[in-house]
């Protein structure tokens, strides 16, 4: 089935913008002028999800790339990776439960819980330039909400 | 306060086009998505279509073609392009704001701007 | 595409009743379903979203429930400007969000 999407830039609530840092990885840094062309356009998809009063499904992908956004566990610990996804499978209703996560809206602050691992959040570090990872704590030191910003064509 | 302002509804013949504006204040349609359902004299609610980024628009199979939804970020205005009308076209034309990014509910309405599609 | 089906069409009642509307998705739509109230000459309200959850600064009489293809939307104890015009909305189905064909509640 078909799917809602739409193209947007995520930046966390310290105005870091989220940029690839080789093939498989995000960073978060503060981006000024011409260099905010580097932040990665991100295509969010809505699909099937839990039963929720407040959460909405979501897949987050790469924008003309077969890449999203999964959690997985590795060394036993829950994971944000870059998956490369077959291009003609993907965007779909029913995603698998890895690359779904939950978006929570406040305030229009984001939050972006994964499915997979509840309490697990997209989360980026206070310091510049760091990997953008999964965090099982939030209202800590790193920083679990971002504002989204659509991109024009 | 958040308010929606919709104009450009009027009299137009059949296989005419009219452009319907609705004008967003209170917030950014940077990061909001803009429906527009309309209503025909004395019937039910009907959904034509969303616009979240310019490049993301969906609508109501029988929209599609005829309608088009389009915004303009820098004057904070949503519109609706419709072309090759048709008596049946004729209703309440209102905008609308998704209340969150793809809960599919609208929160905030504008007043409505009447269209009459007659020769 | 998926069919939103309400009953009844009209519906009299007085204040002070209990009043019950169903809506019927054609398919199962989990919990993605809003009613909206609209009285005559305005625009739609919004009054509850996810089957279940009050819209802000909706009265607590309104209460919505069900999950999959069957909803209700109950007012406990109907007041006077309870009468109106009533709406479901599928939200949740892929790329078309339907509504209900809508039920008019008048006074007995």
């Known amino acids: 089935a078909p799917v809602r999407s739409l193209n947007c830039t995520l930046r966390d609530s310290q105005q870091k913008s989220l940029v690839m840092s080789g093939p498989y990885e995000l960073k978060a840094l503060h981006l000024q002028g011409q260099d905010m062309e580097q932040q990665v356009v991100f295509s969010m998809s809505f699909v099937q999800g839990e039963e929720s009063n407040d959460k909405i499904p979501v897949a987050l992908g790469l924008k003309e790339k077969n890449l999203y956004l999964s959690c997985v566990l590795k060394d036993d610990k829950p994971t944000l990776q870059l998956e490369s996804v077959d291009p003609k499978n993907y965007p779909k209703k029913k995603m698998e439960k890895r690359f779904v996560f939950n978006k929570i809206e406040i305030n229009n602050k984001l939050e972006f819980e994964s499915a997979q691992f509840p309490n697990w959040y997209i989360s980026t570090s206070q310091a510049e330039n760091m990997p953008v990872f999964l965090g099982g704590t939030k209202g800590g030191q790193d920083i679990t909400d971002f504002t989204m910003q659509f991109v024009s064509s | 306060e958040v308010q929606l302002v919709e104009s450009g509804g009027g009299l137009v013949q059949p296989g005419g086009s009219l452009r319907l504006s609705c004008t967003a204040s209170g917030f950014s349609l940077s990061s909001a998505a803009m429906a527009w359902v309309r209503q025909a004299p004395g019937k039910g609610l009907e959904w034509v279509g969303i616009i979240y980024d310019s490049a993301s628009t969906y609508y109501a199979s029988w929209a599609k073609g005829r309608f088009t939804i389009s915004r303009d970020t820098s004057k904070n205005t949503v519109y609706l392009q419709m072309n090759s009308l048709r008596a049946e076209d004729t209703a309440v034309y209102y905008c609308a704001r998704e209340r969150q990014i793809f809960s599919g509910d609208m929160a905030g309405w504008g007043q409505g701007t009447l269209v009459t599609v007659s020769s | 595409e998926i069919v939103m089906t309400q009953s009844p069409s009209t519906l009299s009642a007085s204040v002070g009743d209990r009043v019950i509307i169903t809506c019927q998705a054609s398919?199962?739509?989990?919990?993605?379903l809003s009613w909206y109230q609209q009285k005559p000459g305005k625009a739609p309200k919004l009054l509850i979203y996810r089957a279940s959850t009050l819209a802000s600064g909706v009265p607590s009489r309104f209460s919505g429930s069900g999950s999959g293809a069957e909803f209700t939307l109950t007012i406990s104890s109907l007041q006077p400007d309870d009468f109106a015009t009533y709406y479901c909305?599928?939200?949740?189905?892929?790329?078309?969000?339907?509504f209900g064909q809508g039920t008019k509640l008048t006074v007995k």
């Open positions: 398919q199962s739509i989990d919990n993605w």
């Open positions: 909305q599928n939200t949740g189905g892929g790329v078309s969000i339907a």
